[in-house]
């Protein structure tokens, strides 16, 4: 009842709590002398469902049969209406419509850790829409039964709050959950388990790693576990990898030797635990331990290449270049490179440690036979030295690769192809393809790139340090013993017409012809490999088509003679440059009048 109901009563039959789809009878009756004064026959009793009138009757009582009530709570209120007055509330009642609980499903229990508490979960099934009490019951050895009740509205979890101990780890316990409300009850199927089944160990903690004698091959992982743990599984991976290595161990007692770790690598380690070979569940993975393995001496050998440059009649400049070892070969932080230069006949040797670069330049006499050895050193030792005899790499004309071509191959790649040299092709031990950005001054500071190719290959795809719209000088060397031959070509991965033409800086008269000198187009405006220059000229005030002279591009050329100008005529001259993609806009215009006689 929802208020004091002084004037009358509302009764509900068969009950205030009904099964969905049931019918209820609601009776509203006035108490004696509580009707309308003087006009008791005029009593009008009205029944409201929430705020909606559903029935009325004149007299001292009203009966109403109600069907089709929805799930949940419905409020009925009975009011009295008298003539010339407001309706007076008599009494009311709430009716609760629901269903009996369904059988709870999938009951499962777990204890997190040997000191944890037992908690069980289940699926309630559909909502009953009524207050439903759940009782979790556990039957165990010694004829004991533990139980706990759930006070939550939607109960699908209960924690007993106490701990199952391993005193008889194989003893059976049986759990069951029972749901009860006003319309019925239902129990889950029993779930039977032992201590070993439901205890999920805590993840291992205090994980440490030790390297005996700072060696990666003598590595032990240590951790702490709960006392009853029998099995562990370890997983580890380099920090930059997504794939784990897995190891299962039995009776490890908190330690395990790892034999396959790579040196100088940061690893992530995690451990999980289990109490029994085939019962129970694995713990969560432990927190990660991150640790770097110690260095080992480098393996592998440096890839070394060199350039020779003539200085004068007695001296030459040698520039050595080498590539970093891969991480797996370096096996540590490379502290320095050791370069040894030796004159083979006289036996003089010079050793130098290089830090921070992968190149070295020195000047040596042009006479004698010279060799270099280069090795990489970390804190544990040095790589095997790479030995190279310094020779004239392009001396043997018969070893020069033939028909060298360079073609763009997709974005920032150049495909270099060649034919074997005329001399016995089987004499070639390897090819080296070398490339560097083309700088008109032949700048030796420009980085050098190279790759090695097996003697049976006649092509190489170069992609390292290749930029679009840059021209590269590409050389292919064929090496055979202490001899080498080479051929070169210019190539680019992507090209377009140059952004500007050459700048004419001088025009001079020489014996009836003129010599035009120009400044090279800045590298960043060439937009690829230049194929030709064009020199245009026409008479100053003429509308005729200009004449032109096309000159094949050569790196070092910065002047060209023209001998077809008429004397005492003023000409306008300008230049353009061409790549395979087209011609530049023209450069500056210069006027010139030839003073002498025509040839």
């Amino acid at each position: 009842k929802i208020d004091a109901c002084k004037r009358g009563d509302v009764t509900v039959k068969p009950s205030h709590v009904i099964l969905l789809g049931s019918t209820v009878n609601i009776t509203c009756s006035l108490k004696p002398r509580q009707g309308c004064f003087h006009y008791s026959r005029r009593n009008k009793l009205i029944l409201y469902k929430f705020d909606r009138r559903i029935n009325f009757h004149h007299g001292h009582s009203l009966n109403s049969q109600v069907t089709g009530l929805p799930l949940g709570t419905t409020l009925f209120v009975c009011k009295l209406a008298c003539i010339n007055s407001d309706e007076i509330q008599i009494c009311g009642a709430e009716i609760f419509v629901g269903v009996a609980p369904e059988q709870p499903q999938n009951l499962s229990c777990i204890q997190k850790g040997e000191q944890g508490t037992v908690a069980c979960t289940w699926e309630r099934g559909r909502d009953t829409h009524l207050y439903t009490e759940y009782t979790l019951q556990l039957s165990g050895p010694k004829n004991l039964t533990w139980q706990k009740q759930c006070k939550d509205i939607y109960c699908d979890y209960l924690d007993f709050g106490i701990n199952l101990t391993p005193e008889s780890p194989e003893s059976n316990f049986t759990a069951k959950v029972t749901a009860v409300n006003s319309l019925g009850s239902s129990s889950s199927l029993p779930s039977t388990f032992t201590f070993l089944d439901i205890v999920r160990p805590l993840p291992p903690w205090d994980i440490r790693i030790k390297f005996q004698k700072a060696s990666v091959s003598r590595c032990t992982l240590y951790w702490r576990d709960e006392g009853l743990v029998l099995l562990n599984r370890l997983r580890y991976r380099p920090s930059n990898s997504r794939l784990w290595n897995m190891v299962n161990v039995t009776k490890a007692k908190g330690r395990h030797d790892l034999l396959d770790l790579k040196p100088f690598t940061e690893y992530e380690f995690q451990i999980s635990s289990k109490l029994h070979l085939y019962k129970g569940s694995w713990s969560d993975w432990s927190e990660s331990l991150r640790a770097q393995t110690p260095e080992e001496e480098p393996t592998g050998m440096l890839d070394v290449w060199y350039m020779k440059r003539h200085i004068d009649y007695s001296r030459q400049q040698i520039s050595l270049f080498w590539k970093n070892l891969s991480v797996s070969e370096a096996r540590g932080k490379i502290l320095h490179y050791q370069v040894t230069l030796q004159e083979l006949t006289g036996g003089k040797a010079m050793t130098q440690n290089i830090t921070g670069h992968t190149s070295w330049t020195t000047v040596i006499p042009r006479t004698g036979n010279w060799a270099v050895a280069v090795s990489a050193a970390n804190s544990k030792g040095s790589s095997l030295p790479t030995r190279i005899n310094i020779m004239n790499l392009c001396e043997a004309g018969l070893l020069a690769p033939r028909q060298v071509s360079a073609n763009s191959e997709g974005m920032d790649n150049i495909l270099v192809t060649w034919q074997p040299p005329r001399k016995d092709p089987s004499a070639v031990q390897e090819y080296v393809v070398e490339w560097r950005e083309l700088h008109p001054g032949g700048d030796t500071q420009v980085p050098l790139n190279w790759l090695r190719s097996r003697p049976y290959n006649v092509s190489a795809l170069i992609s390292e340090n290749i930029k679009s719209y840059i021209c590269y000088e590409i050389r292919v060397y064929a090496l055979s013993g202490d001899q080498g031959g080479c051929s070169s070509i210019l190539g680019n991965s992507k090209h377009k017409a140059p952004l500007s033409g050459p700048h004419i800086n001088a025009i001079t008269e020489e014996k009836g012809s003129i010599l035009i000198s120009w400044n090279s187009i800045p590298v960043q405006e060439q937009m690829g490999c230049l194929l030709h220059y064009r020199i245009y000229w026409k008479e100053r005030d003429s509308n005729s088509q200009p004449q032109l002279c096309e000159i094949p591009y050569r790196v070092s050329q910065n002047s060209h003679p023209i001998n077809s100008l008429q004397p005492r005529v003023t000409y306008v001259l300008w230049m353009t440059a061409l790549t395979a993609a087209g011609e530049s806009s023209h450069g500056n215009e210069r006027e010139f009048c030839l003073q002498g006689k025509a040839n």
């Epitope: 508490t117 037992v118 556990l138 165990g140 010694k142 004991l144 533990w146 139980q147 706990k148 009740q149 924690d159 007993f160 709050g161 106490i162 701990n163 199952l164 101990t165 005193e167």
Partner: nanobody, 125 residues
């Protein structure tokens, strides 16, 4: 100083009911496991019922359904409601208290630190 005082014992006909009370002073009942044990003449003390601090209850199957343990935190007291009493329920009933956190420990008398003096229950046929 911790004290446990039982009351509510007496004589009753078979099939009757009794409600035993255990008033506790010096400790809070909701922080401890509370137990009831009984000892019949010439027999060992046996476990009857217990409630953990987390309100998990435990009963031997022999009394389950006839006996209910409950506690009133406000009154700092524990109760044992006994229905459908049988002559074999005749014994001295003891209230006990201890910091027990295990399932098995709730039914073990050596896990309880504090004990009352006991109250006599006699069931006649």
């Amino acid at each position: 100083q911790v004290q446990l005082q039982e009351s509510g014992g007496g004589s009753v006909q078979a099939g009757g009911s009794l409600r035993l009370s255990c008033a506790v002073s010096g400790r809070t009942v909701s922080d401890y496991a509370m137990g009831w044990f009984r000892q019949a003449p010439g027999k060992e003390r046996e476990f009857v019922a217990a409630m953990s601090s987390s309100e998990t209850t435990v009963y031997p199957n022999s009394v389950k359904g006839r006996i209910t343990i409950s506690r009133d935190n406000a009154k700092n007291a524990v109760y044992l409601q006994m229905n459908a009493l049988k002559p074999e329920d005749t014994a001295v009933y003891y209230c006990s208290m201890g910091p027990i956190v295990t399932f098995q420990g709730l039914a073990r008398q050596n896990e309880y630190h504090y004990w009352g003096q006991g109250t006599q229950v006699t069931v006649s046929s």
